[in-house]
Interface confidence: medium
Amino acid sequence: EVEKTACPSGKKAPEIDESLIFYKKWELEACVDAALLATQMDRVNAIPFTYEQLDVLKHKLDELYPQGYPESVIQHLGYLFLKMSPEDIRKWNVTSLETLKALLEVNKGHEMSPQVATLIDRFVKGRGQLDKDTLDTLTAFYPGYLCSLSPEELSSVPPSSIWAVRPQDLDTCDPRQLDVLYPKARLAFQNMNGSEYFVKIQSFLGGAPTEDLKALSQQNVSMDLATFMKLRTDAVLPLTVAEVQKLLGPHVEGLKAEERHRPVRDWILRQRQDDLDTLGLGLQG
């Protein structure tokens, strides 16, 4: 912590500008008014203060707002956000999506830090649910965001938000997460026609039950092997050879290459050899 010293004559900062980068830490502490800093926070991001100097500026804001910063200051924190601890952020009440975007922009290109995770948690809890605009924003910055949530947290995602989800946002989701998301997706896309519906629901199918897979097999969807391999084993096992053949269409030949991997391996073992032979792929049950 910087000790309190009087500001040298003529050094009192009338505004936040680039001349301050040449101030020593004790001069920043003594000569920059905290209230002035708070009202001109938008300028700080355009000034290349060193991290040591940013520590001083943060200290001044902490003294001015011991209960947590107001959103008017938070929105303009810029690089100073990188100096905040999760404990600091837990004191904030962030309600504006613009504020969230501004702070995520600062951390752009880096993996999610504890600060960012805390910020997002505060924001989502404040909103009560993960609405479409928020999800849109979060997945744009962190494609893996959705899959970082627990099934319990995902249960608060309204079906309308599912429209914001892109296939790559689900790449790292496990079956438990897809079990929660699939019914929401099914509800969200229910009014779409067959082929359009399949395009949208495809990346969520790792959470689909057997009856839905059976229904899809009647719609000439031509599911690719990559999607098939992500289906729940327990959902695939009851499917007949004819149903799998209809589900995969021309991609059925790919089963041979995957015959040693789940769920294909387990499914093959459940089928009658006569039925498997009808595929002409040499699959051995």
Partner: antibody
Amino acid sequence: QVQLQQPGTELVKPGASVKLSCKASGYTFTSYWMHWVKQRPGQGLEWIGHSNPSNGGTNYNEKFKSKATLTVDKSSSTAYMQLSSLTSEDSAVYYCARWVRGSNYEYFDVWGTGTTVTVSS
Amino acid sequence: DIVMTQSQKFMSTTVGDRVSIICKASQNVGSAVAWCQQKPGQSPKLLIYSASNRYTGVPDRFTGSGSGTDFTLTISNMQSEDLADYFCQQYSSYPLTFAGGTKLEIK
């Protein structure tokens, strides 16, 4: 990948000026401050100053305030440094360097290829 | 201005050696120090930042340590490709300043 391309050499006469360029590629030019550094043989490196490509803001080492002028051209992602009233003391290699900061660090992560300025009549 | 000093301008070494290069700051700079390597005719390359963090792609034989005013760059198993100039730089306060550097040479 991130690159900062500088012309290799500049031969100038004493008293003249020279404008050095630093063309950035492989990243968003306006997202990072650009610094300039002087290196004379056997004398280490000296920080000249930096410019903020997003708004053209500049800061100079007091020692170089009357020597260097930093500018940027966003449209071509190029930073410039003009050196004036050149003397033999200004003969050196001049580097541009990108300044990066993240959640707990800051540093020059990429240096330009360097321009050798020779002041000679 | 903060003065950075590397008192050894040259160091003789052999392949396999453990080499320590020392850098001193004229005042406390915390951990705001970086180490760079520069080979003849080339631009400097970042090795260590924040005094002790190895930059991406830098071999783990390079380590940085220290804080406050005393900093050390250590090469644990000297290789022939490590023959170069090494310099430290502070970014605790402006103007940013560099030490004169240490040139590693073969004995």
